[in-house]
């Protein structure tokens, strides 16, 4: 939560923003509120982005004013016009892209004064439900060493990967994780666990998106002897 104040002495108003994360490939909201004014025509909202020359969005005299809008935001931004009068200056951003991440400023002018607050906007893409593969995947016996691969796709930013056994005990040894960006900058993650089989065992991987606070789970359960095992099992 960031609260900003105007810098014009007594003519200052409180502007409040909330740091947020947007899902790549969806519409996002950049939250900003301010002390409301009784006349819509007296309210000016300007959204700016650090490192961007033009405006992200401007709303004044009760309507959008887009003549100074930067090219990268053309056709993509909107304020909630009917809620401006009650102090909502939040911005809707269409089709959030990886490049939309950054520091934004919500700048407000009303008849009471001016104020602004910065907002840190992060972008992320959720990881897919992991697919689990086992090698070798048949004729397994207790004591055999197997490699279990957990694969999850099209996430951003890079994931954190955790392995655990059926009792929830973390498995940290013999884990190799690789992450590769595709042409769109999204990551595919492959994590390999080498483990010596017990009589029965459940092995789970958790792929965590640190920006979206999203967890994707996959697990494989190896039971009974002898075993036949499907090439892919989903949790």
């Amino acid at each position: 939560l960031i609260i900003g104040f105007g810098i014009s002495g007594r003519h200052s108003i409180t502007v409040t923003t909330v740091a947020s994360a947007g899902n790549i490939g969806e519409d996002g909201i950049l939250s900003c509120t301010f002390e409301p004014d009784i006349k819509l025509s007296d309210i000016v909202i300007q959204w700016l982005k650090e490192g961007v020359l033009g405006l992200v969005h401007e709303f004044k005299e009760g309507k959008d004013e887009l003549s100074e809008q930067d090219e990268m935001f053309r056709g993509r931004t909107a304020v909630f016009a009917d809620q401006v009068i009650v102090g909502n200056a939040s911005l809707r951003l269409k089709n959030v892209q990886l490049t939309d991440a950054g520091t934004y400023k919500c700048y407000i002018i009303t008849s009471k004064g001016k104020g602004n607050a910065n907002l840190e906007y992060k972008t992320g893409a959720p990881y897919s439900k992991p697919s689990m593969t086992l090698e070798p995947n048949k004729d397994l016996r207790p004591g055999d060493t197997v490699t279990i691969t957990c694969s999850s796709y099209r996430g951003y930013p890079e994931a954190e990967v955790f392995w655990q056994d059926g009792q929830g005990v973390p498995l940290t040894g013999n884990v190799t994780t690789s992450q590769m960006a595709n042409e769109q900058g999204l990551f595919d993650v492959h994590s390999v666990l080498r483990v010596v089989l017990g009589a029965n065992g459940t092995y789970s991987c958790l792929v965590r998106n640190p920006v979206l606070q999203q967890d994707a789970h996959g697990s494989v359960t190896i039971t009974g002897q002898p075993m036949t095992f499907p090439p892919e099992a989903l949790w």
């Epitope: 887009l66 809008q69 053309r74 056709g75 016009a81 269409k94 089709n95 893409a125 769109q184």
Partner: antibody
């Protein structure tokens, strides 16, 4: 060259099913909002469905529960699965990319629902 | 649901004249999410204007868009023979996610 090419239209009986395809070239389908828009003979444009880059989908009330929009990222192709077809579904179906607006359209594929 | 109403339904003008097409929304629409399209018989629509006033790539400067809130206008300053077609306005962002106006037919007088 940025291009969309629809296929899969045809004559179908009421209650039948059809799958329309839209092959994209010159850009990546999964990075854009991709739409299906239809136009009944002599009528205006009617939005049918959208799939966001994230995979989230939305539908017009007139088709909700009867159509499914999807995509195959590996084929860079958009689909519209249409079930329980009615006479009023007769139209030219266009796929369209939405960046800042619907800036790229296919040539359309005709669906005729008739017994 | 936002309804877009275009007027007039049909506009009869001569080449060289100025055309003014109106699009009125039943509730406020963000200027960023308002677009205009041109469609000729047997062809797919073509994007003319996005963000209420920005010309799409390759669109001649005789086409201009303006307006905000609930009232939007497409103006063709000097009609060329190839401009006679049907014009649609369209909004994004409310339920349903996209809405088109019913169209204005621009015909040769």
């Amino acid at each position: 060259e940025v291009q969309l090419v629809e296929s899969g239209g045809g004559l179908i009986q009421p209650g039948g099913s059809l799958r329309l395809s839209c092959a994209a070239s010159g850009f990546t389908v999964s990075s854009n909002y991709m739409n299906w828009v239809r136009q009944a003979p002599g009528k205006g444009l009617e939005w049918v469905s959208v799939i966001y880059g994230s995979g989230r989908t939305y539908y017009a009330d007139s088709v909700k529960g009867r159509v499914t929009i999807s995509r195959d990222n590996s084929k860079n192709t958009l689909y519209l699965q249409m079930n329980s077809l009615r006479a009023e579904d007769t139209a030219v179906y266009y796929c369209a990319r939405d960046t800042y607006a619907m800036d790229v359209w296919g040539q359309g594929t005709t669906v005729t629902v008739s017994s | 649901e936002i309804v877009l109403t275009q007027s007039p339904g049909t506009l009869s003008l001569s080449p060289g004249e100025r055309a003014t097409l109106s699009c009125r929304a039943s509730q406020s629409v963000s200027s960023s999410y308002l677009a205009w399209y041109q469609q000729k018989p047997g062809q797919a629509p073509r994007l003319l204007i996005y963000g209420a006033s920005s010309r799409a790539t390759g669109i001649p400067d005789r086409f201009s868009g303006s307006g905000s809130g609930t009232d939007f206008t497409l103006t063709i300053s000097r009609l060329e023979p190839e401009d006679f077609a049907v014009y649609y306005c369209q909004q994004y962002g409310s339920s349903p996610m996209y809405t088109f106006g019913q169209g204005t037919k621009l015909e040769i007088k």
